[in-house]
């Protein structure tokens, strides 16, 4: 019968969702509740991940697949498989050891996560600043000054700023 008596490993007949039960002659047994085996031929079932505290369940555990977690509102996932939840900040901020802090002048963050990044230096590409940067948005680079000769463009040059790339806060 199906539990092969040949030289092949009898455990190979055990489907996902079961384990090869060493307690009873390598017969396939269903995984207990709150455990799973995602592939056939397993000798044990893995304990289901529990999404507790700041984690919440995105996908329930089944006999063949682990639970999947995400983070409660105000937090976001970090790491493979959402192994950690990190506090959200507002746009224009970054998370430090002391909590959420505004981006320093000359940097921005347009997401609720991650770090503040420097504004783009338009001049490195031979371009000029079309829209000034803020804590929440990067600068927008426009045509190079050479492209702005009379009649060459209808783009109005930006008003002079107190410092390059800076928008009054």
């Amino acid at each position: 019968f199906e539990r092969t008596r040949s030289l092949q490993d009898p455990c190979s007949n055990c489907p996902a969702g079961t384990f090869c039960d060493n307690n009873r002659n390598q017969i396939c047994s269903p995984c207990p509740p709150n455990s799973f085996s995602s592939a056939g031929g397993q000798r044990t079932c893995d304990i289901c991940r529990q999404c507790k505290g700041v984690f919440r369940t995105r996908k329930e555990c089944s006999s063949t697949s682990n639970a999947e977690c995400d983070c409660t509102p105000g937090f976001h996932c970090l790491g493979a498989g959402c192994s950690m939840c990190e506090q959200d900040c507002k746009q224009g901020q970054e998370l430090t050891k002391k909590g959420c802090k505004d981006c320093c002048f000359g940097t921005f963050n347009d997401q609720k996560r991650g770090i503040c990044r420097p504004w783009t230096n338009c001049s490195l590409d031979g371009k000029s600043v079309l829209v000034n940067g803020t804590k929440e948005r990067d600068v927008v680079c426009g045509p190079s000054p050479a492209d702005l000769s009379p009649g060459a463009s209808s783009v109005t040059p930006p008003a002079p700023a107190r410092e390059p790339g800076h928008s009054p806060q």
């Epitope: 019968f1 996902a16 307690n23 009873r24 269903p30 207990p32 509740p33 709150n34 089944s62």
Partner: antibody
Amino acid sequence: QVQLQESGPGLVKPSETLSLTCTVSGGSISSYYWSWIRQPPGKGLEWIGRIYTSGSTNYNPSLKSRVTMSVDTSKNQFSLKLSSVTAADTAVYYCARDGWYDEDYNYYGMDVWGQGTTVTVSS
Amino acid sequence: EIVMTQSPATLSLSPGERATLSCRASQSVSSNYLSWYQQKPGQAPRLLIYGASTRATGIPARFSGSGSGTDFTLTISSLQPEDFAVYYCQQDYDLPWTFGQGTKVEIK
């Protein structure tokens, strides 16, 4: 709680195929093995075989050449087919939830049974 | 396959008496995988004892199971009128699962 209900023809002609279905209600068919057992009139219980929700099967060697089991998880049902029947296959046929472990690896026997359906093989 | 042999085939007793039913396996069976079932006429079997000695949900304390290896026992300490029935032992330690031929407990 989980309940099982067998259904199928009560009369089958010799040499034909007996077909029965077991419907699982009050719970999911998933994550368990499911067994068929039969009992000829006035006799004891005989295990026919079992099927897992993935379709993996184990059959009693005494019947293996004639038995086919299948499962339909979308309908919460599993089925038995027994080919080339003779009068010796006349019996009450039961479906049951096969043994399983709880979270602490305590093993439970066949704890849920259908009420049984009588199948007579006669021309 | 593992052959399960029950004795006696029939047990004639009066209500209030103690019933001792025996089940012997042709080879050693882990006690975790030995069950006892009760069957009344026209009804499906009902799980009484699993793991050789653990009562299933709703089973009265007068039913008890014991044993290990090849020899197992079901004891009914004081027979009640509703206990007169056929009792089967069953192993699911090794495929194919097998039942004993049954012991009928009848009123004397």
